[in-house]
Structures are given as C-alpha cells and as structure tokens.
C-alpha cells in the first residue's frame, strides 16, 4: 500500500535568464528510494540514483545543475522552459511516486514564488 | 458530478480537418484544466493536448503539434480539438478530460478527475 506524498516547490515564476530550483520530498513512507527521475513534459532531464549517483541528460548538461539533495537546478532560463516538471520516485517496496511542478518563465521582471502543496 | 460529452467525431480522408468538441456540465468549468487524449487499437492512451482554466498555457504533443490546436469557450463550457492535415495514425478514440483544479496545463492522464466516453476519429481513403 502507497501512504507516502510528495511535497514539491509548486507553481513557480521565475525571470527569463535566471535560474530555479526544483525540490520534492517524499514524506509519510518508509520505503526506500532507489532512484529519482526528473522529466520536463516527454523529457529525461536527469537521473540520481542512490548507487550510481547523478546523470544530467547530455541535451541538458549547459543548463542543469544536480542538487541541492534530490533537487534540480534549472539555469539561463528561456521562455521556452515553461511547462510542466515532474519528479519521479522510484521506490521500494512502495513502487512510483509522481510530483508535478509548473513553471513559468517570466519576461518581465515581476517573479514570484507560489506556495507549496502536497500531491497525494 | 461533472460530466464530459464528446462529439465531432467520423470518418474523415488523410489530409483532411475535423473538429471535436467536448461539452462540460455539471460543475465549474472555467476553474478546470482540461486535456485531450487519444487512444488507438491495441496501443495505450496517450496525450494529444492540453490547456489551462485560463486558457494561458498550451500543451501539445510532438505528434501533433503544428496540425492540432487546442481551445476553449468559458461561456459555453466546452472544449475544442480542431484537427487538421488529418493522418492514418491519428486514428483513434478521443477522450476529453477535466481536473478540478490547478496551475497551468496537465499534460499527464494521472492528473485527471474526470473522462468523457469518446469520439471514434478514423482517418481513412
């Protein structure tokens, strides 16, 4: 049985050239996390797995940064990166646990951070 | 109880446009994400478009993109896929779907409350 959640950074707002950082932590579980996934919509932006460690998509490496933690840092932000974000949770023995995250990248210089939530 | 009907559906040549529409009632449309997926025989459902409640953010995918357009009308709580340059391959169920709320565009299944029945689209010579 599932019982964990992930508890993400949110919708966020950032400025074109900037740069973000994506967190999720998964909570309420005792289960062992093997492996993290990043993704942009279809996209494998990287990997930290908890034997192998980090692997940042080639197509990514000027613009990814791995960490802080499990986190993701986005860099040299264009209007291009808005959309969705989704980190994977490969568990044991729970199985996959999903957060969504959605950023909007900001030609103006008005930026804000949008509260945390909890997906189940 | 919100409810999702699809229609616009049939059987349209290669090349060709059709245009489906998905009538929402029964809840607060213009608060709902709300996407287009397909699926195909014998293969899974997969995501054709996407757009938020306040009709800011789109999202198509790759197969798609240049020849679909996704859209809504608040006023009339419904939804529209307009197809064009119509191909074998988009041969398919459609299925509208609404979430209750949230930010920008959901372009996963898993993010969904609630799916219409479909609309068979099958693009045939």
């Known amino acids: 049985m599932m019982t964990g959640t992930i508890e993400t950074t949110g919708n966020i707002s950032a400025e074109k050239g900037g740069s973000i950082i994506l967190q999720c932590h998964l909570s309420s579980t005792t289960a062992q996390v093997t492996q993290v996934n990043w993704e942009q919509q279809d996209q494998l932006l990287a990997i930290c797995n908890a034997d192998l460690g980090w692997h940042i998509s080639p197509s990514f490496k000027d613009r990814v940064a791995p960490g802080p933690g499990l986190g993701l840092t986005l860099q040299s932000l264009t209007v291009n990166d808005t959309g969705e974000y989704f980190c994977i949770y490969h568990t044991y023995p729970d199985g996959t646990y999903t957060g969504r995250i959605f950023l909007e990248v900001l030609e103006s210089s008005v930026a804000e951070h949008g509260a945390r939530f909890q997906i189940p | 109880q919100v409810q999702l009907v699809e229609s616009g559906g049939g059987v349209v040549q290669p090349g060709r446009s059709l245009r489906l529409s998905c009538a929402a009632s029964?809840?607060?449309?213009?608060?709902?994400?709300m996407g287009w997926f397909r699926q195909a025989p014998g293969k899974e459902r997969e995501s054709v478009a996407a757009i938020s409640s306040d009709l800011r953010f789109t999202y198509y995918a790759d197969s798609v993109k240049g020849r679909f357009t996704i859209s809504r009308d608040n006023s009339k709580n419904t939804l529209y896929l307009q197809m064009n340059s119509l191909r074998a391959e988009d041969t398919a169920v459609y299925y509208c779907a609404a979430r209750e709320s949230g930010v920008g565009y959901y372009s996963r299944a898993q993010w969904y409350d609630y799916w219409g029945q479909g609309t068979l689209v099958t693009v045939s010579s």
């Open positions: 029964g809840g607060s449309f213009s608060s709902y994400p």
